[in-house]
């Protein structure tokens, strides 16, 4: 664009150099050339000469009018045709921008990843604004009334060291640009309720050579949280439907989960956990692929009547991937309950 240009005159924009996309815009060019009474004044947009909607206002000034200007950025310049000059003479130039006022930030979420030392807040920014837009994150203690503000562009990490005076906070986000400001809804945060346990990792899996082979999946976490609720989902690599098993876990030792699976098949396993009774889940762990061994004796394998082990498994349900290209995006289709209480309704955010 044009940032530093020696002008022999002036160029100005109505309603302003940054305006709302879709507005009608007038751009004026006024020459102040020495030894030139211009025959014509010309406008250029992004280097291309404009031909329409140009009005000569008087000897020194011309205007170009744009109906519903909808380009996010353009650089404009104007020139004069001076008698006796072979080339046009530059008068002035301006960068212009159009955009939108921000939408109100939505889906504000704040979590503390265990051991991170930060509260991470994220939100949906809404539609693109096309112009510089900042987010002011307000964090107000409900106990001391002290308010802190943080500037962000899409998310913010706030050191928990600066949140030591209180456990309860009100958090909200203001989206601001030169065209407007909008506030998110306020989020009530209790620091003890937003901790996400340290990442859960599937370390290995093995299939036994028993008459009825079983697969044991080993998984662990460095979490110090005592009561943790976890889900493990698994499926064959050729299938779109995941089965989900739920566990109450105690990570003072490596977890072992037993599965009766189809022989000679490649399975994918993933696990995620949350503090029991809280609402924030870990992201699903990296996919762990395991090949079950070949069938040794003949038997009828019935996947949905297989004996699930005595572990703290509560429910098994099925979810189906929306697309084979997006294995992380899941949608609850049905829940098949094997024992214990029904699924807790948390499956809508699987993925």
């Amino acid at each position: 664009g044009i940032t530093s240009i020696n002008c022999s005159g002036d160029m100005w924009v109505e309603p302003g150099e940054i305006f709302q996309m879709g507005m009608n815009v007038s751009i004026y060019c006024q020459e102040a050339l020495k030894h030139c009474r211009p025959r014509n004044l010309y406008f250029y947009k992004n280097g291309f000469k404009e031909e329409f909607d140009i009005t000569r206002i008087n000897r020194t000034t011309a205007r170009i009018w744009y109906k519903g200007f909808s380009e996010p950025h353009a650089y404009m310049h104007c020139t004069a045709e001076c008698p006796g000059h072979f080339q046009e003479t530059l008068i002035c130039g301006k960068d212009i921008s159009s955009g939108h006022p921000p939408d109100a930030p939505s889906n504000l979420t704040c979590v503390i990843y265990e051991y991170s030392g930060n509260m991470t807040c994220t939100w949906n920014t809404g539609k693109p604004t096309y112009i510089d837009t900042k987010y002011i994150v307000h964090v107000k203690s409900l106990e001391t009334e002290e308010e802190q503000q943080y500037l962000a562009s899409s998310y913010v990490k706030i050191s928990t060291d600066s949140l030591q005076g209180s456990r309860k906070y009100l958090v909200w986000v203001q989206a601001v640009n030169s065209l407007g400001m909008e506030n998110s809804q306020q989020l009530h945060v209790h620091l003890d309720d937003i901790v996400i346990p340290s990442a859960s990792i599937i370390s290995r899996a093995e299939t036994t050579n028993d008459t009825v082979p079983k697969t044991i999946v080993y998984w662990k976490s460095k979490t110090m949280i005592e009561k943790v609720f976890c889900e493990m989902r698994y499926k064959t690599t050729t299938n779109q439907t995941w089965s989900v098993k739920e566990f109450d876990a105690n990570f003072t030792y490596v977890q072992q989960s037993e599965f009766y699976l189809e022989p000679d098949s490649k399975y994918v396993f993933q696990v995620r956990c949350q503090e029991t009774g809280k609402r924030n889940w870990q992201p699903w762990s990296s996919p762990f692929v395991h090949q079950t061994s070949q069938e040794t004796g003949k038997r009828n394998w019935q996947p949905w009547s297989s004996p699930f082990v005595h572990q703290t498994s509560q429910t098994v349900s099925q979810v189906t991937a929306k697309s084979s290209h997006e294995p992380q995006k899941m949608e609850m289709l049905s829940a098949t309950i094997f024992r214990g209480h029904p699924a807790s309704g948390n499956h809508q955010d699987i993925g």
Epitope: K134, I136, L151
Partner: nanobody, 116 residues
């Protein structure tokens, strides 16, 4: 760390004008997104005006057309020209240095009182 010092507040009749100044010292001033904020008694601290990296400026609806933000980079100083002042503009005015991901740093503030 940036230090900010506001000045220029005072008492004025409705319809009058004031020019607030905010002088910044410290080596990280260049990374600041500078803004003017105000806080009336018992209210939140609200953004009045902020300048963006593209050179554009935000003004709160309540001050549009009356207040003008300007800056003098050579002096590390920003200004808020306040015209046509109203009683509802009465507040403590603060300038703030905001850098991405960091807590906003405030000056001590300067009191503006507009009487009718």
């Amino acid at each position: 760390q940036v230090q900010l010092q506001e000045s220029g507040g005072g008492s004025v009749q409705a319809g009058g004008s004031l020019r607030l100044s905010c002088a910044a010292s410290g080596d990280t001033y260049s990374s600041c997104t500078m803004g003017w904020y105000r806080q009336a008694p018992g209210k939140e601290r609200d953004l009045v005006s902020m300048v963006f990296s593209d050179g554009s400026t935000f003004y709160a609806d309540s001050v549009k057309g009356r207040f003008t933000f300007s800056q003098e980079n050579a002096k590390n100083t920003v200004y808020l020209q306040m015209n046509s002042l109203k009683p509802e503009d009465t507040a403590m005015y603060y300038c703030g240095c905001a850098t991405l991901g960091s807590r906003t740093i405030w000056g001590q503030g300067t009191q503006v009182t507009v009487s009718s």
